[in-house]
């Protein structure tokens, strides 16, 4: 009678997570009887997966009947996987024992590789807004994949950024990988739109990558350019200055006239217009009273955006060739508004 | 340490019934086929019943003399084994073994102590 | 059913000597290459003790001086050498087919 002998035919076994992994075994003889256990890892710390005589496995259910007369397969199906099952699994025959059984011989062993999809990409930026011609670095991470291979791809409106840096941890073995990638973006004025995209391409995901998106809109900063005008007398003794408040973002802004350094009125962008690209213009007009004035007038429009330290822009209203109105107390009378409400 | 603990046996009329138990204990009770087998001067030793796993769907089989009288059956919460007998005849005399089945082909490696059936009138 | 025939019903044997019973089935009892016999010791209020599994194959915890041989139909017990302690009734049993049955027993006693 030949020695029984443990044949574990398949040297590794890949499944994906969720599915069930089907591990097989078979012995060549009922004899010795005793148990086929089943354990994950070699040596004196090795874990117990099923024990076909003591014990309780609900997650693992035999191949075949293993009460059938003459049974010599003892393959095993654990339900459920995660990346946590990922190991070198051991069909191992005991020998009967009193009082307790003695290992008789092991199977060479199935390596149980657990494909895991890695999770969806989060893209963040920078806590702060940073203006156009600055470069900003963007950070994109994806955990719980597994095997390690990944591919990581930055995008800025559909062109592929090169300027990144990416780690996928931990660098030794591990039952699932993290990968965390930071990439550097140079902003235009024409950023309002555009998006950042992170790509990630996984054996798992077969051939549609997933994909995490940041706004610039939430990144750029594209500060106004400020146009002070004089128009044509609207009455013999009334100027109507504007101050045109262009290309700016995002939209929260307040505006400030000043005359003679003295502030005149302050007010907070409301109804703006849109460009095309995404920033915004807004106009604020004052209208002034030049018969209250003696001397020439410097009126300031000064904007205060997004929290930033003001900007503003002059205007010298010549006011000499203007004549004096006696006992008017109103140095001048104010009007805000926009393009659209013009009066 | 295996032990297997008969109960239940005692003097009985013919046509009576009995119900013997059997509770287990030392061995992860519902991975093992249960049997009873009895003994007695006249038959000698006589394999009476045998109930399989709830994966086997809990399939029993009886001795021919017992067939239709007896029902053998498993509480595997109770680590417990049973038979219940009915219209009992004196040749049903004998001691009754709980006996576990080690390797699902009659392998009777742990026997009970046996408990004593008498049907006598 | 299988009926299984022991012989001899009993035997005494000098202590040190080899004993030899005898089971014979009334039909085979191998399958796939195994024969599903099983040889058992009983001693005066006791229930029977197992020491061969398969017609060959000692039982944890048995003394190597039994030993089981045969296939088929015809199956042996030794027992060598004999020691005091081995006085007792030994049965065979067979798990061919349904019912399982035992053989009559052989009561073995020491000279």
């Known amino acids: 009678e030949e020695e029984l002998q443990v044949i574990q035919p398949d040297k590794s076994v890949l499944v994906a997570a969720g599915e069930t992994a089907t591990l097989r075994c078979t012995a060549t003889s009922l004899i010795p009887v005793g148990p086929i256990q089943w354990f994950r890892g070699a040596g004196p710390g090795r874990e117990l997966i099923y024990n076909q005589k003591e014990g309780h496995f609900p997650r693992v259910t035999t191949v075949s009947d293993l009460t059938k007369r003459n049974n010599m397969d003892f393959s095993i199906r654990i339900g459920n996987i995660t990346p946590a099952d990922a190991g070198t699994y051991y069909c191992v025959k005991f020998r009967k024992g009193s009082p307790d059984d003695v290992e008789f011989k092991s199977g060479a062993g199935t390596e149980l590789s657990v494909r895991a999809k890695p999770s969806a990409p989060v893209v963040s930026g920078p806590a702060a807004r940073a203006t156009p011609q600055h470069t900003v670095s963007f950070t994109c991470e994806s955990h719980g994949f597994s095997p390690r291979d990944i591919t990581l791809k930055w995008f800025k409106n559909g062109n592929e950024l090169s300027d990144f840096q990416t780690n996928v941890d931990p660098v030794g073995e591990s039952v699932s990988y993290s990968i965390h990638s930071t990439a550097k973006v140079v902003l235009t004025r024409e950023d309002v739109h555009s998006q950042v995209i992170c790509e990630v391409a996984h054996v798992t995901l077969q051939g549609d990558p997933l994909r995490g998106t940041a706004n610039l809109s939430e990144t750029i900063r594209v500060p106004p350019t400020l146009e002070v005008t004089q128009q044509p007398v609207r009455a013999e003794n009334q100027v109507n200055v504007t101050c045109q408040v262009r290309k700016f973002y995002p939209q929260r802004l307040q505006l400030t006239w000043l005359e003679n350094g003295n502030v005149s009125r302050t007010e907070t962008a409301s109804t703006v217009t849109e460009n095309k690209d995404g920033t915004y213009n807004w106009m604020s007009w004052l209208l002034v009273n030049v018969s209250a004035h003696r001397d020439d007038v410097k009126l300031t429009c000064q904007v205060e955006h997004d929290g930033q330290p003001a900007v503003s822009k002059s205007h010298d209203l010549k006011v000499s060739a203007h004549p004096k109105e006696q006992g008017s107390n109103t140095a001048a009378e104010n009007t805000g508004s926009n393009e659209r409400n013009i009066y | 340490e295996v032990k297997l603990e008969e109960s239940g046996g005692g003097l009985m009329q013919p046509g009576g019934s009995m119900k013997l138990s059997c509770v287990a204990s030392g061995f992860t009770f519902s991975n093992y086929w249960m049997n009873w087998v009895r003994q007695s001067p006249e038959k000698g030793l006589e394999w009476v019943a045998e109930?399989?796993?709830?994966?086997?769907?809990?399939?029993?089989h009886y001795a021919e003399s017992v067939k239709g009288r007896f029902t053998i059956s498993r509480d595997d919460s109770k680590s417990s084994v049973y038979l219940q007998m009915n219209n009992l005849r004196a040749e049903d005399t004998g001691i009754y073994y709980c006996?576990?089945?080690?390797?699902?082909?009659?392998?009777?490696?742990?026997w009970g102590q046996g408990t004593t059936l008498t049907v006598s009138s | 059913d299988i009926v299984l025939t022991q012989s001899p019903a009993s035997l005494a044997v000098s202590l040190g000597q080899r004993a030899t019973i005898s089971c014979r089935a009334s039909?085979?009892?191998?399958?796939?290459?195994?024969?599903?016999m099983y040889w058992y010791q009983q001693k005066p209020g006791q229930p029977p003790k197992l020491l061969i599994y398969?017609?060959?194959n000692l039982e944890s915890g048995v003394p190597a001086r039994f030993s089981g041989s045969g296939s088929g139909t015809d199956f042996t017990l030794n027992i060598h050498p004999v020691e005091e302690e081995d006085a007792a009734t030994y049965y065979c049993?067979?798990?061919?087919?349904?019912?399982?049955?035992f053989g009559g027993g052989t009561k073995l006693e020491i000279k």
């Open positions: 049993q067979h798990s061919g087919e349904l019912p399982y049955t």
């Open positions: 398969l017609a060959s």
């Open positions: 006996i576990r089945d080690y390797d699902y082909d009659a392998y009777f490696d742990y």
């Open positions: 109930i399989r796993l709830k994966s086997n769907n809990y399939a029993t």
């Open positions: 039909k085979s009892v191998s399958t796939s290459g195994y024969n599903y």
